[in-house]
Amino acid sequence: LEVQVPEDPVVALVGTDATLRCSFSPEPGFSLAQLNLIWQLTDTKQLVHSFTEGRDQGSAYANRTALFLDLLAQGNASLRLQRVRVADEGSFTCFVSIRDFGSAAVSLQVAAPYSKPSMTLEPNKDLRPGDTVTITCSSYRGYPEAEVFWQDGQGAPLTGNVTTSQMANEQGLFDVHSVLRVVLGANGTYSCLVRNPVLQQDAHGSITITPQRSPTGAVEVQVPEDPVVALVGTDATLRCSFSPEPGFSLAQLNLIWQLTDTKQLVHSFTEGRDQGSAYANRTALFLDLLAQGNASLRLQRVRVADEGSFTCFVSIRDFGSAAVSLQVAAPYSKPSMTLEPNKDLRPGDTVTITCSSYRGYPEAEVFWQDGQGAPLTGNVTTSQMANEQGLFDVHSVLRVVLGANGTYSCLVRNPVLQQDAHGSVTITGQPMTFPPEA
C-alpha cells in the first residue's frame, strides 16, 4: 500500500494549527470498516491518534489532534495538530493498513518569529570618541535559535567583539541577547539583525551614537588601524608613535601603556626613565628609539589571554592617546579522521566520521565536502573546547549513509590566519574495514 507524505518538513508557527498531510489510494469498494489508521511519533512510537474498527479512536496526544473524517474515505489520512508547541517538533509516522499496509514519516518543523530587537547602551552618558561601549541587542520568544548579525551604518559587518547568548524559556522559545563591544568613532550607527533561519524572517534594531568631542590633546598619537596579529608563543610589537617637537627631551615624556577596557597598567616610562613592566614581566619599550617618537611596546611570548585593546597614552606638555588591537592566533593541526563503525562496512550503512584538529585559536570554521566537491551540510555536529591556555580543540562529526564508495573531506579553517588544515577519508568497496587492513 503506497502512503504519501510531503518530502519537505511541515513548518508551523507556535500556537497555530498544523496539518500533517498523509494520503493513500483506496481501491474500488473500499469501506472505512476495513481501515486501520495509526499516527505515532516516529522515534518513541508513542501513539498520537488512531482510527480503527470503523471509528475515530480519538487523540492520544494531549487532545490536540484530529483527523479529517469526512475525507478519510477518499484516502486523506491527514492529521490536524492544534496549538502547536516547540515540543511537538519532530517526525510523525502515518501507518495505514487495509488488507496490505504502508507507512511514511512526515517531519514537523516548529518556528516562532523573533520580536523587534530592543537596543541598550552602556555607558550611556558623557560618551567621547575612543570610549569603549557595550551595545546590547535583545529579541524575544523566537524559535529555532537565531542567527545574529551586526553592521555599521555603511552596512559593513561588525564581527569584532560580539558575544551572543540564547536561552530557552519553559515553552522552549529562545530569548537572544547579543552584546557588541566597540570603540566609538566620531559618531556611528550600529545595527543588529536577528534572523529566524527557518522562517527566513529578519528583525532589525539599530542605535545611533553621537559622542561629545573630547578635548583634543595637542600630541597626535598614531597606531595601526588594523589589529596586530600575533601567533601564540611569539613576540608582538604594538606600534605607537608621536612627533616630538624640536628640543624635546625624554625627561618631559610620560608614556603609559594600559589595557583599554580595564585601564590596568601594562608598562610606563615617566620621570625620564623606564618604570618597567607591570604586565607579567613580558613587555619592553624600544628605549633607543623613544627620543625619535617611537613609543611602541614589545609583548613577549604572546598568550590567548593577551588578546584585546591596548591604549598608548603620551603626555609631554599636552597629551594624546590611541588604542591598538592585538589579535592572537594559533594554527590548527592537520585533522585526524576516525570512522565508527570501522569494520564490515556496506553501502547503506550509517557511519559517523569524526574530524579532530587541535590547539588552534580563535575558534575554527569547519567545512565538509564529498569526493565531487559538493558540500556535506546534512548531519554535522561541531564542538570546540578551549584548553587551559585558551587554545581550541575542534571535533566535527558527520553522520552519513555510505554509498558504494566515497571520499569525505573535512577542512578546518583558522579565520584570522586564513590557514586551512585538511583531512579526508576514502571508503571503497564492500564490505570493508577502516583503516584498510594491510
Epitope: F367, Q372, G373, S424
Partner: antibody, heavy 121, light 106 residues
C-alpha cells in the same frame, strides 16, 4: 582534449519543454559531476543543478525544482537537461560545466559552448 | 543560501591601472572560485580555491581575503583583461555566483 559539446539552439513555445544535451569526451565521464548554469540576455550566471553521472544523484536549485530534470547516459557519456513549462523568462544561454579538481579544490574547469533557448509565442 | 555580492557592478579603467573587485559572502565560505567571461563566449576558470590561478592566467591577477570579503586585484590592467568576472561558492547548498563585475577599457 577534455570537451563538453552541447546541442544546437532551440526555439520553443511557452508551456512546452526543451531538452538540451551535453556530450563529454576526453575524460572518465562518471568521475565528475556535471552542472547546468544558465545566463539570461545581459544577465549573470545562475546555477540550476547538477547530476553525478555515476550514482545519478541530482540536486536542483529551489527555483527550478519540479521544472528541471537532469539525466545522464553513461553509455554515450552524455548529460541532459530538460526544462518544462517554459516561459519567456527562460530565454537564455544554457551551459553545462564539469565540476573538477581534487579535494578540496573544486571548480568549473570545463564549460560547454552554450545552447541558446528562445521561448516565444 | 550564501549570497555573493560583487562590487562594483561596472568599472571603466585605463590600461596599466590597478583594479580591485570585491566579492562579499553573506556568511563564511570554504573556498571561492572566480571566472572570466568575454562577450559571446563561455565562462573560463580564472582563480580557484580562493587564490590559485587557473592554467594560463597571468600573474598580475591575485586574490586577498579579509573575513568574508574576497578581493580580486589586477595589478596593471591590460586590454585583454576587459571582461566580466564572476565569483562562485559551493560551501553550502545551493551553489551561488556573484552578480558579476564588468571591466571596460577606457
Amino acid at each position: 582534449e577534455v570537451q563538453l559539446v552541447q546541442s544546437g539552439a532551440e526555439v520553443k513555445k511557452p508551456g512546452s519543454s526543451v531538452k538540451v544535451s551535453c556530450k563529454a569526451s576526453g575524460y572518465s565521464f562518471t568521475s565528475y559531476t556535471i552542472h547546468w548554469v544558465r545566463q539570461a540576455p545581459g544577465q549573470g550566471l545562475e546555477w540550476m543543478g547538477y547530476i553525478n553521472p555515476n550514482s545519478r544523484n541530482t540536486d536542483y536549485a529551489q527555483k527550478f525544482q519540479g521544472r528541471v530534470t537532469l539525466t545522464a547516459d553513461k553509455s554515450t557519456s552524455t548529460a541532459y537537461m530538460e526544462l518544462s513549462s517554459l516561459r519567456s523568462e527562460d530565454t537564455a544561454v544554457y551551459y553545462c560545466a564539469r565540476y573538477s579538481g581534487s579535494t578540496p579544490y573544486w571548480y568549473f574547469d570545463v564549460w560547454g559552448q552554450g545552447t541558446t533557448v528562445t521561448v516565444s509565442s | 543560501e550564501i549570497v555573493l555580492t560583487q562590487s562594483p557592478d561596472f568599472q571603466s579603467v585605463t590600461p596599466k591601472e590597478k583594479v580591485t573587485i570585491t566579492c562579499r559572502a553573506s556568511s563564511s565560505v570554504s573556498y571561492m572560485n572566480w571566472y572570466q567571461q568575454k562577450p559571446d563566449q563561455s565562462p573560463k576558470p580564472w582563480i580557484y580555491a580562493t587564490s590559485n590561478l587557473a592554467s594560463g592566467v597571468p600573474s598580475r591577477f591575485s586574490v586577498s581575503v579579509s573575513g568574508t570579503d574576497h578581493t580580486l586585484t589586477i595589478n596593471s590592467l591590460e586590454a585583454e583583461d576587459a571582461a566580466t568576472y564572476y565569483c562562485q561558492q559551493w560551501s553550502s547548498n545551493p551553489l551561488t555566483f556573484g552578480q558579476g563585475t564588468k571591466l571596460e577599457i577606457k
